[in-house]
């Protein structure tokens, strides 16, 4: 995974704006899913909180030390000025842990983006036309990824010749929206912390 060099940007911390939009968009989508899929377990009381990024990314582990070590004294030996090509941390001196945290957030977004796009392609084929993913939510994920802009291999959308299992897709949608909302809260907290520091 590459952690490239920064391009200065005089503006305020733009990723905070994107992360707030993301949290709003996923919350709205989840609300819509709860209402539309009323016969599916889609409330936070009913759902199983599972995470598709488990064992694949380490966002909580990578980002938690940022809050625990506000003065970054224990990170000074590893401090460096590499950051992202994107505008999120432009013109900031960044610790290794901070770069790792943002890189992990990017990987999370990429994984969820692939899952959501794959699911949406299936839902668009559903004769019941019951629910589709909010294009705004997909666009906001894109925007935040572009703002982070890590050099990363693009993951092709999972295409399948199989007939879509609409029943499973809707159950999975509820599980993933809940998991993604929790991750969006984490991302927003990280961005708020970085904006304040």
């Amino acid at each position: 995974r590459n952690l490239p060099v920064a391009t200065p940007d005089p503006g305020m911390f733009p990723c905070l704006h994107h992360s707030q939009n993301l949290l709003r968009a996923v919350s709205n989508m989840l609300q819509k899913a709860r209402q539309t899929l009323e016969f599916y377990p889609c409330t936070s009381e009913e759902i199983d909180h599972e995470d598709i990024t488990k064992d694949k990314t380490s966002t909580v582990e990578a980002c938690l030390p940022l809050e625990l070590t506000k003065n970054e004294s224990c990170l000074n030996s590893r401090e460096t000025s590499f950051i992202t090509n994107g505008s999120c941390l432009a013109s900031r001196k960044t610790s290794f842990m901070m770069a790792l945290c943002l890189s992990s957030i990017y990987e999370d977004l990429k994984m969820y983006q692939v899952e959501f796009k794959t699911m949406n392609a299936k839902l668009l084929m559903d004769p019941k036309r019951q629910i589709f993913l909010d294009q705004n939510m997909l666009a906001v994920i894109d925007e935040l990824m572009q703002a982070l802009n890590f050099n990363s291999e693009t993951v092709p959308q999972k295409s399948s010749l199989e007939e879509p299992d609409f029943y499973k897709t809707k159950i999975k949608l509820c599980i993933l929206l809940h998991a993604f909302r929790i991750r969006a809260v984490t991302i927003d907290r990280v961005m708020s912390y970085l904006n304040a520091s």
Partner: nanobody, 114 residues
Framework: EVQLVESGGGLVQPGGSLRLTCAAS????????MGWYRQLPGKQRELIAH???????TYADFVKGRFTISRDNVKNMVYLQMNSLKPEDTAVYYC????????WGQGTQVTVSS
């Protein structure tokens, strides 16, 4: 390593009943959503019933009212009670998680025929 062992299948007459059992071990946690899937001859595997860790259930339209999914989180078991069986229910039945369903058991064959 994940292990899923399905049992309880067999030959049954139309209108009859069967109870399928799934023993789950390894990294299949009791807080995962679980489901029963079936694979008809020449078709792909499809989800037919789903149960959350807290016992909330849903069913595919074609088994609603006939099949009942349940689980025992302590024993790591998932069950499928199948009533009013029809010839078109003839298939291999599997249990698995809803997410991360990478490893599959051997399944259990259910044949409904007179």
């Amino acid at each position: 390593e994940v292990q899923l062992v399905e049992s309880g299948g067999g030959l049954v007459q139309p209108g009859g009943s069967l109870r399928l059992t799934c023993a789950a071990s390894g990294s299949i946690a009791s807080n995962s959503a679980m489901g029963w899937y079936r694979q008809l001859p020449g078709k792909q595997r499809e989800l037919i019933a789903h149960i959350t860790s807290r016992g909330h259930t849903t069913y595919a339209d074609f088994v609603k009212g006939r099949f009942t999914i349940s689980r025992d989180n302590v024993k790591n078991m998932v069950y499928l009670q199948m009533n009013s069986l029809k010839p078109e229910d003839t298939a291999v039945y599997y249990c698995n998680k809803i997410l991360h369903s990478d490893y599959w058991g051997q399944g259990t064959q259910v044949t409904v025929s007179s």
